[in-house]
Interface confidence: medium
């Protein structure tokens, strides 16, 4: 099922044009998206086709800063959005308790070295519940066709994965078990091969700050949850978690 969702997400990616002709990279974004009032949405961008190191990603709504994900300093959510914005997954951002006022343009700004700055644009439309349901009825035939195609793809993937997993089951179990042991002990997990300075670390525990001093009780559970996610190749901003 995860593979299917990943494929659906990948098919929805849009490529954003770049400001400078000198830079080789491209930013892929989720493009134009809609969500229901009161619901939540994940904003995702992905930088590809460049070897530049990502030093920081800024998330902005029009001219307002929502969040920063810095390779060394970790996540920072703007104080005015802390109650409704959650870091991740990966370098993405989760917007919660959506209101109609959240409709508008969102930008992911990648600070990279040596390329410079890349910007991706996402347009979010927050719909009233009834409008969202009404819109969904028209999408059913299209979704049916897509679903049929995806069922074929997924079946093939599941067969391949099942065969591969039989061989790797023991090794995977041991890796995940090790991650769980580390998280249960409240230790900050850092990659065995630390990423080069200035790169956004791609294997971490819970998003930085979620397990701060004031959020201690849920820490082990969050660490466990995000460790499993990171094993499924979803990166995160920083390995820094506060435990004292």
């Amino acid at each position: 099922m995860r593979w299917c969702l990943l494929l659906i997400w990948a098919q929805g990616l849009r490529q954003a044009p770049l400001a400078s002709g000198m830079m080789t990279g491209t930013i892929e974004t989720t493009g134009n998206i809609s969500a229901e009032k009161g619901g939540s949405i994940i904003l995702q961008c992905h930088l590809s086709s460049t070897t530049a190191q990502v030093t920081q990603v800024n998330w902005e709504q029009q001219d307002q800063l929502l969040a920063i994900c810095n390779a060394d300093l970790g996540w920072h959510i703007s104080p005015s959005f802390k109650d409704r914005v959650a870091p991740g997954p990966g370098l993405g951002l989760t917007l919660q308790s959506l209101t109609v006022n959240d409709t508008g343009e969102y930008f992911c700004i990648y600070h990279t070295y040596p390329d410079g700055t890349y910007t991706g644009r996402i347009f979010l439309e927050v719909l009233e519940s009834s409008v969202a349901e009404h819109g969904a009825r028209f999408q059913i035939p299209l979704l049916g066709a897509m679903a049929a195609t995806l069922v074929v793809i997924c079946t093939a993937v599941i067969v391949v994965v099942a065969l591969t997993r039989k061989k790797k089951a023991l090794r995977i179990h041991s890796v995940e078990g090790d991650l769980r042991r580390k998280s249960a002990g409240q230790e900050e997990w850092s990659p065995s091969a630390p990423s080069p300075p200035g790169s956004c670390v791609q294997a971490e525990a819970a998003p930085a700050g979620l397990c701060g001093e004031q959020r201690g009780e849920d820490c082990a559970e969050l660490h466990d949850y995000f460790n499993v996610l990171s094993y499924r190749s979803l990166g995160n901003c920083s390995f820094f978690t506060e435990t004292g």
Partner: antibody
């Protein structure tokens, strides 16, 4: 409890170098960023730079680039700040400070090391 | 580079009085932090992100503001509150501090 203990006061001649240490205890050393800040007599606090203690990545204030070097000894849970080509205006108290993730602030500070540059 | 300017430079007040310290940014910023420093000591975190009191800070302290203007208020000064207060900002890739406001006994 978290503690940052810095090395003692230093007196240096212009043109010399100084290396200040900051020994951390009470937390996982490599899971935090360490910043260095200085304060000249009667002046505001001035940020020098930081070191990512997991991967030794550094970032410097442009003013100190090429003169300041931040390093660490993970086995000793100690961070170092070396400043070269000292001049009289480098006379200041130098602080190490741990970065508080998510708030983007410095939550624990060393007691400070006075570096006097005088001929 | 964003510059933080604190005012006044010195505030002379008596215990029990109300103190209002200002921190102005040269352009709009998301938040500031406040630190307290006493002579011969290292700065201590006092207020995080505009208004969150650091651990152990008494409720007579409060922070407010937005955009370019931020304020630290001490509702009724106690003898131990006389010190220098600095505001601080992280603005990629630089950390900047205000020049400080000294709260002294009148």
């Amino acid at each position: 409890q978290v503690q940052l203990v810095q090395s003692g006061a230093e007196v240096k001649k212009p043109g010399a170098s100084v290396k200040v240490s900051c020994k951390a205890s009470g937390y996982t050393f490599t899971s935090y960023v360490m910043h260095w800040v200085r304060q000249a007599p009667g002046q505001r606090l001035e940020w020098i730079g930081y070191i990512n203690l997991n991967n030794d990545g550094t970032k410097y204030n442009e003013k100190f680039k090429g003169r300041a070097t931040l390093t660490s000894d993970k086995s000793a849970s100690t961070a170092y700040m070396e400043l070269s080509s000292l001049r009289s205006e480098d006379t200041a108290v130098y602080y190490c400070a741990r970065w508080r993730v998510y708030y983007y602030a410095m939550d624990y500070w060393g007691q400070g090391t006075l570096v006097t540059v005088s001929s | 580079e964003i510059v933080l300017t604190q005012s006044p430079a010195t505030l002379s007040l008596s215990p029990g009085e109300r103190a209002t310290l200002s921190c102005n940014a040269s352009s709009s910023v998301d938040y500031v932090h406040w630190y307290q420093q006493k002579p011969g000591q290292a700065p201590r975190p006092w207020i995080y992100e505009i208004s969150k009191l650091a651990s152990g800070i008494p409720a007579r302290f409060s922070g407010s503001g937005s955009g370019t203007s931020y304020t630290l208020t001490i509702s009724s000064l106690e003898p131990e509150d006389f010190a220098v207060y600095y505001c601080q900002l992280w603005n990629y890739p630089l950390i900047t501090f205000g020049q400080g406001t000294k709260v002294e006994i009148k």
